[in-house]
């Protein structure tokens, strides 16, 4: 038997806010022509599904944000590859589970400037995955999430403020002064901190 | 038609180490996942671990952890339980089987006896 | 570990009659994600491998004679033979697959009465 790994390498699924895209490379012997077949299925299920939108396609990516949208479940994918000269190679994901693998993007944040004030508003994150009733879940609605928020008044003094409310407001600061802030999504039961959103405002001038 | 065939078995002394091969035939071995599962003499089934053939990543029955390692050579389409430090209580037959929860195919077996 | 336990130990029934095996888990086997209970059954011949039966608790396999049933939810669960062939004197076996390490009954062996 020839080496899969010759034809088809690192199948995983690249998953960030419940988005779930399937990805993988060609293997050395791997050609534009190579062509790629997706199948996924859920855990102890005997049969594949195959992924419509995604056989003999020559991209390497698959998304299957609706396919895997149950946040509960264990999914499974898999790759087959066939070169132009016939040979074959299929390779299958780890067991995927979206609440456990998806990375968290930065909130979506206003930061206002008051005069001795940062006010921060952080807005639900939407995500993919639907309700009973059809409509879209937000990130607070799947996980017991807290916000963390930091605000740097200068190289060696930074201002902390946490929890789980969506405004917050860093108060006692010096008007018309530039401060970076940063605010994460924290999820403790699971180990997950989302990339920060940073802003970088500048307190109003003191018209008094 | 899919067929496992385990060889690699026979008389090991106390303490010695073995390496079990699981050849898959009529399916890619990196498909579906693959299991190691044992059976002492006239006693009953126990699951040793899993691999998954494609990434290489394993879970073990913490029972077995530290003493059997689970390995997979995609090219030659066969899986591998190495087994270190053997003691009598290891004889059994082994048996590779395949899939994610519950086993559609076995091998036949390969008998292990661990005795001085 | 979940322990699975089964009863009888063996099991003597004549010819066409029924036989029913027992498994009971130390734990719910309810598979949250899509209500189906996570419980393999599997006959053993002398000299051969396991063979699967029965998956989903009650998900006949391929190939597997239709009077092989599998029944129960949570921790409860029975294999019936509706009605005993000679082939099917074995030793029965059930198999969680709720979590990690999988785990079997001790086995049920069958024999003509």
């Known amino acids: 038997p020839e080496d899969p790994s010759d034809l088809l390498q690192h199948v995983k699924f690249q998953s960030n806010n419940f988005e779930n895209i399937l990805t993988w490379d060609s293997g050395p012997e791997g050609t534009p022509d190579t062509v790629y077949s997706i199948e996924y299925k859920t855990y102890g299920e005997r049969d594949w599904v195959a992924k419509k939108g995604c056989q003999r396609i020559t991209r390497k990516s698959c998304n299957l944000t609706v396919e895997t949208g149950n946040h509960t479940e264990l999914y499974y994918a898999r790759v087959t590859a066939v070169s132009a000269g016939g040979r074959s190679a299929t390779k299958m994901t780890d067991r995927f589970n979206s609440l456990q693998h998806t990375a968290l993007k930065p909130p979506d944040v206003t930061c206002i400037p008051k005069v001795r004030s940062i006010q921060m508003i952080v807005h639900p994150t939407p995500t993919p995955i639907r309700a009973g009733d059809g409509h879209r879940l937000t990130l607070e609605d799947i996980y017991d999430l807290s916000y963390h928020l930091e605000l740097q008044v200068n190289r060696t003094y930074q201002m902390h403020l946490g929890g789980k409310q969506r405004e917050y407001e860093f108060f006692g600061l010096t008007p018309d002064t530039e401060f970076l802030g940063t605010i994460m999504i924290c999820v403790p039961t699971w180990s997950k901190k989302s990339a920060p959103y940073m802003c970088r405002v500048r307190t109003l001038p003191d018209r008094t | 038609e899919v067929q496992l065939v385990e060889s690699g078995g026979g008389l090991v002394q106390p303490g010695g180490s073995l390496r079990l091969s699981c050849a898959a035939s009529?399916?890619?071995?990196?498909?579906?996942?693959m299991n190691w599962v044992r059976q002492a003499p006239g006693k009953g089934l126990e699951w040793i671990g899993e691999?998954?053939?494609?990434?290489?990543?394993?879970t073990y029955n913490q029972k077995f952890k530290g003493r059997f390692t689970i390995s997979v050579d995609q090219s030659k389409n066969t899986a591998y339980l190495q087994m270190n430090s053997l003691r009598a209580e290891d004889t059994a037959v082994y048996y590779c089987?395949?899939?994610?929860?519950?086993?559609?195919?076995w091998g036949q077996g390969t008998l292990v006896t661990v005795s001085s | 570990d979940i322990v699975m336990t089964q009863s009888p130990d063996s099991l003597a029934v004549s010819l066409g009659e029924r036989a029913t095996i027992n498994c009971k888990s130390s734990?719910?086997?309810?598979?949250?994600?899509?209500?189906?209970?996570?419980l393999a059954w599997y006959q053993q011949k002398p000299g051969q491998p396991p063979k699967l039966l029965i998956y989903?608790?009650?998900s006949r396999e391929s190939g597997v004679p239709d009077r092989f049933s599998g029944s129960g939810s949570g921790t409860d669960f029975t294999l019936t033979i509706s009605s005993l062939q000679a082939e099917d004197v074995a030793v029965y076996y059930c198999?969680?697959?709720?979590?990690?390490?999988?785990?079997f009954g001790q086995g049920t062996k069958v024999e003509i009465k």
């Open positions: 009529g399916y890619s071995i990196t498909a579906e996942y």
């Open positions: 089987a395949r899939f994610d929860a519950y086993f559609d195919y």
């Open positions: 989903w608790a009650s």
């Open positions: 198999q969680q697959y709720y979590s990690y390490p999988f785990t």
């Open positions: 691999i998954n053939p494609s990434t290489g990543t394993t």
């Open positions: 734990q719910s086997l309810l598979y949250s994600s899509n209500q189906k209970n996570t």
